[in-house]
């Protein structure tokens, strides 16, 4: 009779996380009598996976009925595989004794676990930045195996090239993580832009995972201001508007100053949105020129998104020609000021009046 051999036909087996792994093992003889054991790893630190003779192994089932006569198939199935199960598994024949003694081992089957990467999480800078500045975005994905993985960055569908990627750990591990940092130059048109981190892995069957960050969370587009004097609406009244254009985000506070004194403060609420995602807003001030003897310096001061205020001034000249219309002149008279604001282009019939 030829001496028993332990045959493990598969050098390697690859299984997706969550599935069952079948590890094949047959012996070539019924002699010697004794149980089969399965181990992960070799040497004194090997881990017992299954012992035919004794023990409780809830995740392991035998593929064939080991109690049946002349059974020589000791293949096992391990359920609910996780990356932690990766390793080399040995089918070992023991010889009956007190205690049973190891007789012969199979050559081993390497189990590799294909684990999907987690959904990429993209995070941007803590503080907003303005156009022309370069900002960093990070992308992280975890828990994948094997180690080979591809990560790409896109901005609005255009692939980025300025990024650095690390896969950890460097050595062998049950699973891996990827971390990438991309540099993105902001433009004024980026409110609607998206930065996308795309991860491709063998487990994803050609359907990469994507993580996105909206640049609307990152960008601050400072407003441009224009102060203009409208034609006289009524005797002794001049309408001065402050056009606040192309700003983002919406958080904005506007203060009117007359000769340096605060006249009115308001917060942008109803705004118009531009196609590029920025906002426009207009505030107007009705000045009763009869109340002023001297020229009036009107200042539109805007504090945007908590940043230092920017302002634009307009000189309102007080002259002896009450009905003359012009950008810098108005009739001299006395009376109260009327102030107001509007987000409408046609201020004649849509504005609101506030009397003081």
């Amino acid at each position: 009779e030829e001496e028993l051999q332990v045959i493990q036909p598969d050098k390697s087996v690859s299984v997706a996380a969550g599935e069952s792994a079948i590890l094949h093992c047959t012996v070539t003889s019924l002699i010697p009598v004794g149980p089969i054991q399965w181990f992960r790893g070799a040497g004194p630190a090997r881990e017992l996976i299954y012992n035919q003779k004794e023990g409780h192994f809830p995740r392991v089932t035998t593929v064939s009925e080991s109690t049946k006569r002349e059974n020589m198939d000791f293949s096992i199935s391990i359920s609910n595989i996780t990356p932690a199960d990766a390793g080399t598994y040995y089918c070992v024949k023991f010889r009956k004794g007190s205690p049973d003694t190891e007789f012969k081992s199979g050559a081993g089957t390497e189990l590799s676990v294909r684990a999907k990467p987690s959904a990429p999480v993209v995070s941007g800078p803590a503080a907003r930045a303005t156009p022309q500045h370069t900002v960093s975005f990070t992308c992280e994905s975890h828990g994948f195996s094997p180690r080979d993985i591809t990560l790409k960055w896109f901005k609005n569908g255009n692939e980025l090239s300025d990024f650095q990627t690390n896969v950890d750990p460097v050595g062998e591990s049950v699973s891996y993580s990827i971390h990438s940092t991309a540099k993105v130059v902001l433009t004024r048109e980026d409110v609607h832009s998206q930065v996308i981190c795309e991860v491709a892995h063998v487990t994803l069957q050609g359907d990469p995972l994507r993580g996105t960050a909206n640049l609307s969370e990152t960008i601050r587009v400072p407003p441009t201001l224009e102060v203009t004097q409208q034609p006289v609406r009524a005797e002794n009244q001049v309408n001065v508007t402050c056009q606040v254009r192309k700003f983002y985000p919406q958080r904005l506070q506007l203060t009117w100053l007359e000769n340096g004194n605060v006249s009115r403060t308001e917060t942008a609420s109803t705004v118009t949105e531009n196609k590029d995602g920025t906002y426009n807003w207009m505030s107007w001030l009705l000045v009763n020129v009869s109340a002023h003897r001297d020229d009036v310096k009107l200042t539109c001061q805007v504090e945007h998104d908590g940043q230092p205020a920017v302002s634009k001034s307009h000189d309102l000249k007080v002259s002896a020609h009450p009905k003359e219309q012009g950008s810098n002149t108005a009739a001299e008279n006395t009376g109260s000021n009327e102030r107001g604001s509007s987000d409408y282009k046609d201020d004649d019939d849509k504005h609101h009046h506030h009397h003081h």
Epitope: I31, V33, K53, T67
Partner: antibody
Framework: QVQLVQSGAEVKKPGASVKVSCKAS????????INWVRQAPGQGLEWIAM????????HYNQIFKDRATLTTDTSTSTAYMELRSLRSDDTAVYYC????????????WGRGTLVTVSS | DIVLTQSPDSLAVSLGERATINCRAS??????????IFWYQQKPGQPPKLLIY???NLDSGVPDRFSGSGSGTDFTLTISSLQAEDVAVYYC????????FGQGTKLEIK
Amino acid sequence: QVQLVQSGAEVKKPGASVKVSCKASGYTFTNYWINWVRQAPGQGLEWIAMIDPSDSETHYNQIFKDRATLTTDTSTSTAYMELRSLRSDDTAVYYCAMDYGSLYAMDYWGRGTLVTVSS
Amino acid sequence: DIVLTQSPDSLAVSLGERATINCRASKSVSSSGYNYIFWYQQKPGQPPKLLIYLASNLDSGVPDRFSGSGSGTDFTLTISSLQAEDVAVYYCQHSRDLPTFGQGTKLEIK
């Protein structure tokens, strides 16, 4: 190590039934067959039947097929052999034995249970 | 059913001498290249003990003065040098199909 501990001696009247137990330890009960063998005083060994505790598959010696029933309780790793319609010639030591190689052999034996059938 | 017949029924051998017990099957007990014959030793007041499995393989812990041979229908248990502790009844058993035992051979010291 493997141990098979059998229930104590029984005295039965003819026509009665006896149920002998065999509690296994030191191994996974459902992975190996249990055989039952008897030996009348001064006589040889007589195979009664065998059971696979994993699925309760049984094989009986034709002589005992109508009178013997093998069962197991996997929760307690115990095998049972019930013999009905006892006769005086059923007086014997009843052994349970575990088949370690699935060869239908008897590798480990219990110490035996003496069943005496007498009126 | 396969019937096993042992010979002799009893045997007396001097200490240190060879003892040979035969077992004949009514038909072949061979299957898949294996001879399904087993030998047991039973001492008074004790359960049987497996000595030899599949005709020629020594069970664990059994002294190597015991050996088994044969194939098909004819099998032999040999004790090469009888020791006092070998006094016992010896049984052959087959499992080619459902198990049966031989009638036993009583071994004594001459």
